[in-house]
Amino acid sequence: LNTTILTPNGNEDTTADFFLTTMPTDSLSVSTLPLPEVQCFVFNVEYMNCTWNSSSEPQPTNLTLHYWYKNSDNDKVQKCSHYLFSEEITSGCQLQKKEIHLYQTFVVQLQDPREPRRQATQMLKLQNLVIPWAPENLTLHKLSESQLELNWNNRFLNHCLEHLVQYRTDWDHSWTEQSVDYRHKFSLPSVDGQKRYTFRVRSRFNPLCGSAQHWSEWSHPIHWGSNTSKENPFLFALEA
């Protein structure tokens, strides 16, 4: 199973292959190569992938991952039971739904099994790392001669999501966008019947249940107007 590793975001300090840690003089720790950062995403609260850049290691190394939850009934250290691989080297760990506890501090530890003192421990707030599936079943209703309403569904608790609707006509060079709260419906009050419109939606786990920064993928687009409006002036649903 190959995985795609998200690339760094241009921080100039991360370009070096390694650094020597400069610890206070009374430290017992030895200078060691740093381990790669672990990045976790919770996909629709169905599973979680925690990945790292295995190619940042000076030589191919099967790093191991352990995790636990701080101050909870789930504070027992767990070994990763489902590793992800990149070119036959461990590059991530996949956790299943029963192992995900959104509102407890998630602690993840990466370790070099050949040098056990070489380890890095991170803490994560999983509720800020949720990425929902893209919205589905987009439908358009003509409420009046000039007003359209767009509806969609999410495979998740609807009140936890905010949405971003984008639309444009065939005459537009760019999208117009509108934020929508958990109600997952959007009205366009003034529609030009001579134009063909395209709509799409994406969703985010924010702000009621978490503070995620990452949006879902865009939905499949749905179109209205021009030819399609003649077929059924009152309803047009996306055909997958």
Epitope: T21, M23, Q109
Partner: nanobody
Framework: QVQLVESGGGLVQAGGSLRLSCAAS????????MGWFRQAPGKEREYVAI???????FYADSVEGRFTFSRDNAKNEVYLQMNSLQPEDTAVYYC????????????????????WGQGTQVTVSS
Amino acid sequence: QVQLVESGGGLVQAGGSLRLSCAASGRTLSRYAMGWFRQAPGKEREYVAIDSWGGDTFYADSVEGRFTFSRDNAKNEVYLQMNSLQPEDTAVYYCAGAPTSFATTAYSSSNSYRYWGQGTQVTVSS
């Protein structure tokens, strides 16, 4: 290179407050994971408060609800507000920083930090 300099330590009575500051020079901290650690005589260094540059902050159990981490990227400084201090809080307090690629990275392991200050002594008398 980043230089970190702590200040604000001192002697305080139990129940009192102190505010530690950590000033950075040489590079902006806006994309650094930062941490406050402490080391009491004869004990291992332990994390007190850690923070990702995305704003996720975590505290050690022993200080939760009493200590508050904050950062001011414009001033290139981080702070540790310490309230309701107890004798067990007596230690040398260190500020540490690590450049990170991801906004969510917060390290509780001291060996993950690249840069360290020289430390500031905090003594809480009973």
